[in-house]
Interface confidence: medium
């Protein structure tokens, strides 16, 4: 179920940290690759990704979005295919660039 999927993200939540709008990472050839440590969920087209199970999906935070968050930390929420910034205190905005 979704509970397992969401819990599998293992992303900490801090009420004091303001994090802004999720951004869709650019599509690339790895987008459809399954991640080995994620629980089952329905993939588009019904494919279960058996051949790709042990190939780790690239985290856009380590590539295209490496310097995206100005005053914050980039986080990739895989089940939503989305990048978000965890802003440092007092900073806000999509890229934590506003104070």
């Amino acid at each position: 179920g979704l509970n397992d999927i969401f819990e599998a993200q293992k992303i900490e939540w801090h009420e004091s940290v303001r994090v802004e709008q999720v951004v869709k990472p650019p599509q690339n050839k790895t987008e459809s690759e399954n991640t080995s440590d994620k629980p089952k969920r329905k993939k588009k087209g019904g494919k279960n990704g058996k051949n790709r199970r042990n190939r780790k999906k690239k985290n856009p935070c380590n590539a295209e979005f490496q310097n995206f968050c100005i005053h914050g930390e980039c986080k990739y929420i895989e089940h939503l295919e989305a990048v978000t910034c965890k802003c440092q205190q007092e900073y806000f905005g999509e890229r934590c660039g506003e104070k």
Epitope: L2, N3, Q9, V17, E20, V22, K43, L80, E81
Partner: antibody
Framework: EVKLVESGGGLVKPGGSLKLSCAAS????????MSWVRQTPEKRLEWVAT????????YYPDSVKGRFTISRDNAKNTLYLQMSSLRSEDTAMYYC?????????????????WGQGTSVTVSS | DIVMTQPPLSLPVSLGDQASISCRSS???????????LHWYLQRPGQSPKLLIY???NRFSGVPDRFSGSGSGTDFTLKISRVEAEDLGVYFC?????????FGGGTKLEIK
């Protein structure tokens, strides 16, 4: 201004199929997960489907699993719901809804904007 | 599935009065991450539902501060401090802690 406009509803016989569309504007469509929710003639709300931003992951309740398929075209800013093997209990107003508010850590998004809905009637 | 119960079906109020709408879930809505994913929507006559409150007590953008949400575990309340004409309609609670997402049957706020 966030705007969601549903279309494609109508009258269909039991066992038939229908494809609903939802045209989105006023926000970066490709950045948001999206959902379909329906409202029965008795005015009860029922979650129907959710799709991730790129369309890779889709989620359904058991009541529609295997019969309904949610999809999206980010280039066209459009969300779809393909419904097949329709039953009388699928008769409802179908709403397209954006998943938000987008705050980090809120994995279980509330539906922050809804369209006006499109009516589906399944009857012989 | 989680059952969301909203008594009463109808709540008659006078404009300017305080209104209190309750919602009860069949299981605790506290998620393992510590958050409680209980939301409130208002559906005005002839309109689609609008988000008022998310995660128990957070007012959505543009929602007046006369609306407030509270509660924990299985019991939740939406309060309207001074009811205005535009507040009339059906209020739905909804949970997204457990799958499938479920909604209450709604409470209709109407003029006494």
């Amino acid at each position: 201004e966030v705007k969601l406009v549903e279309s494609g509803g109508g009258l269909v016989k039991p066992g038939g199929s229908l494809k609903l569309s939802c045209a989105a504007s006023g926000f970066t469509f490709s950045s948001y997960p999206m959902s379909w929710v329906r409202q029965t003639p008795e005015k009860r709300l029922e979650w129907v489907a959710t799709i991730s931003t790129g369309g890779t992951y889709t989620y359904y309740p058991d009541s529609v699993k295997g019969r309904f398929t949610i999809s999206r075209d980010n280039a066209k800013n459009t969300l779809y719901l393909q419904m097949s093997s329709l039953r009388s209990e699928d008769t409802a107003m179908y709403y397209c809804a954006r998943q938000g508010p987008i705050y980090y850590g809120n994995y279980y998004y509330a539906m922050d904007y809804w369209g006006q809905g499109t009516s589906v009637t399944v009857s012989s | 599935d989680i059952v969301m119960t909203q008594p009463p079906l109808s709540l008659p109020v006078s404009l300017g009065d305080q209104a209190s709408i309750s919602c009860r879930s069949s299981q605790s809505l506290v998620h393992s991450d510590g958050n409680t994913y209980l939301h409130w929507y208002l559906q005005r006559p002839g309109q689609s539902p609008k988000l008022l409150i998310y995660k128990v007590s957070n007012r959505f953008s543009g929602v007046p501060d006369r609306f407030s949400g509270s509660g924990s575990g299985t019991d939740f309340t939406l309060k309207i401090s001074r009811v205005e004409a535009e507040d009339l309609g059906v209020y739905f609670c909804s949970q997204s802690t457990h799958v499938p997402y479920t909604f209450g049957g709604g409470t209709k706020l109407e003029i006494k």
